[in-house]
Interface confidence: low
């Protein structure tokens, strides 16, 4: 009973929840649940019954494969979906799919926290601002990635003349999307444009 599959999809997309193996032959009943006890749809005696739920009108069952099609998924659809199959023998078998729905990340805004000449070098502190999202950050200087230590929302670095980059890019990403924001400097150490 340890079948658990993880799926991550972008909000607004159409999703197919299915299992990677064949259904048991001549099963008696197939039911999809949202969480552990909320029925979405049940197939029994060559007929599908759709239950009153937030999915009504958004789901379709393919009894041949057991696949459940959900249209226009939203973050509120995040859950573990369970497909339970009742075999002719009377035994039950279940499969679980953990669905994570993520919004596309918004375009980040780079905020210049601090920029100053220091010991003939350029001290730079930039923050990459996006509204309350759990994302990964990657910073680039003239399209070259900064080392991994710098991969959070704030870039703090001291640039020597041989290390100057003109433009700094913050790339925010989650597992379904990615967006960039860029700020450019005029050597040695002044803001040029966004």
């Amino acid at each position: 009973q340890g079948h658990l599959v993880h799926m991550t999809v972008v909000s607004g997309s159409n999703v197919t929840l299915n299992i990677s193996e064949s259904l048991p032959e001549n099963y008696k009943q197939l039911t999809w649940f949202y969480t552990f006890d909320q029925k979405i749809v049940e197939w029994d005696s060559r007929k599908s019954k759709y239950f009153e739920s937030k999915f009504k009108g958004r789901v379709r069952l393919d009894p041949q494969s057991g696949a459940l099609y959900i249209s226009k998924v939203q973050k509120e659809d995040n859950s573990t979906y369970i497909m339970r199959v009742l075999k002719k023998t009377g035994n039950e078998q279940e499969w679980k799919i953990k669905l994570q729905v993520l919004d596309p990340v918004p375009k980040p805004v780079i905020k210049i926290e601090k920029i100053e000449d220091m010991d003939d070098n350029c001290y730079l502190k930039l923050s990459c601002v996006i509204p309350g999202e759990s994302v990964n950050y990657t910073w680039y200087g003239d399209k070259r990635p900064f080392p991994k230590e710098l991969q959070n929302s704030v870039l703090e670095t001291t640039l020597m003349p041989h290390n100057y980059s003109r433009c700094y890019t913050c790339q925010v990403s989650n597992s379904v999307s990615s967006k960039n924001g860029t700020v450019c400097l005029s050597p040695p150490c002044t803001l040029a444009r966004s």
């Epitope: 010991d119 070259r144 080392p147 710098l150 001291t158 640039l159 290390n163």
Partner: antibody, heavy 118, light 108 residues
Framework: EVQLLESGGGLVHPGGSLRLSCAAS????????MSWVRQAPGKGLEWVSL????????YYADSVKGRFTIFRDNSKNTLYLQMISLRAEDSAVYYC???????????WGQGTLVTVSS | EIVLTQSPGTLSLSPGERVTLSCRAS???????LAWYQQKPGQAPRLLIY???SRATGIPDRFSGSGSGTDFTLTISRLEPEDFAMYYC?????????FGQGTKVEIK
């Protein structure tokens, strides 16, 4: 001229604690990330910890995570490494080093020896 | 983490000879983020090369670095007496920062 001077090393029993200091001069200390790197006797170099210029971000090698704390006092131009639950394998010369653009280490202090032994 | 393997472990040479030290990475080092350090007994390491091939300030031009990806080389064109020391490579393209185990260049 950039100078880094470590202190605070010594002999400590397993399970004990020690605090290392690194006094910096010759540059605007608060503008640079700093790091600790160690070298066990007769062995190679191992990166230990990093702190950003403002002190807001810290990073640790897995081997010291949860036992070592890096911090800095920019008003005193001093970097620190607080070490607890010391083990024999922590015995090493500990160097503080200025991070150049979060890339390589340049320059390094002369090092301070930490010996963990019963 | 990226493992750096230096070879040979020890080199026994005479002043005036040309030296080639190798540093091989277990995976590609991004943007040639590789540095070389020299360390003499009882002293701290000193930066020689950064970015695989750029000489640090004050480093004589007999020291040169080359390579990219997984294979890097430090060359000393003509050994001077003060060059007998340990040499370490270090990658700074991915976390954690890692060093090679070192190559000892000793007088024959």
């Amino acid at each position: 001229e950039v100078q880094l001077l470590e202190s605070g090393g010594g002999l400590v029993h397993p399970g004990g604690s020690l605090r290392l200091s690194c006094a910096a001069s010759g540059f605007t200390f608060g503008g640079y990330a700093m790091s600790w790197v160690r070298q066990a006797p007769g062995k190679g170099l191992e990166w230990v910890s990093l702190i950003s210029g403002s002190g807001g971000s810290t990073y640790y090698a897995d081997s010291v995570k949860g036992r070592f704390t890096i911090f800095r006092d920019n008003s005193k131009n001093t970097l620190y490494l607080q070490m607890i639950s010391l083990r024999a394998e922590d015995s090493a010369v500990y160097y503080c080093a200025k991070y150049s653009n979060y890339d390589y280490f340049d320059p390094w202090g002369q090092g301070t020896l930490v010996t963990v032994s019963s | 983490e990226i493992v750096l393997t230096q070879s040979p472990g020890t080199l026994s040479l005479s002043p005036g000879e040309r030296v080639t030290l190798s540093c091989r990475a277990s995976q590609s080092v991004s943007s040639s983020y590789l540095a070389w350090y020299q360390q003499k007994p009882g002293q701290a390491p000193r930066l020689l090369i950064y970015g695989a091939s750029s000489r640090a300030t004050g480093i004589p031009d007999r020291f040169s670095g080359s390579g990219s990806g997984t294979d890097f080389t430090l060359t000393i064109s003509r050994l001077e007496p003060e060059d007998f020391a340990m040499y370490y490579c270090q990658q700074y393209g991915s976390s954690p920062r890692t060093f090679g185990q070192g190559t000892k260049v000793e007088i024959k």
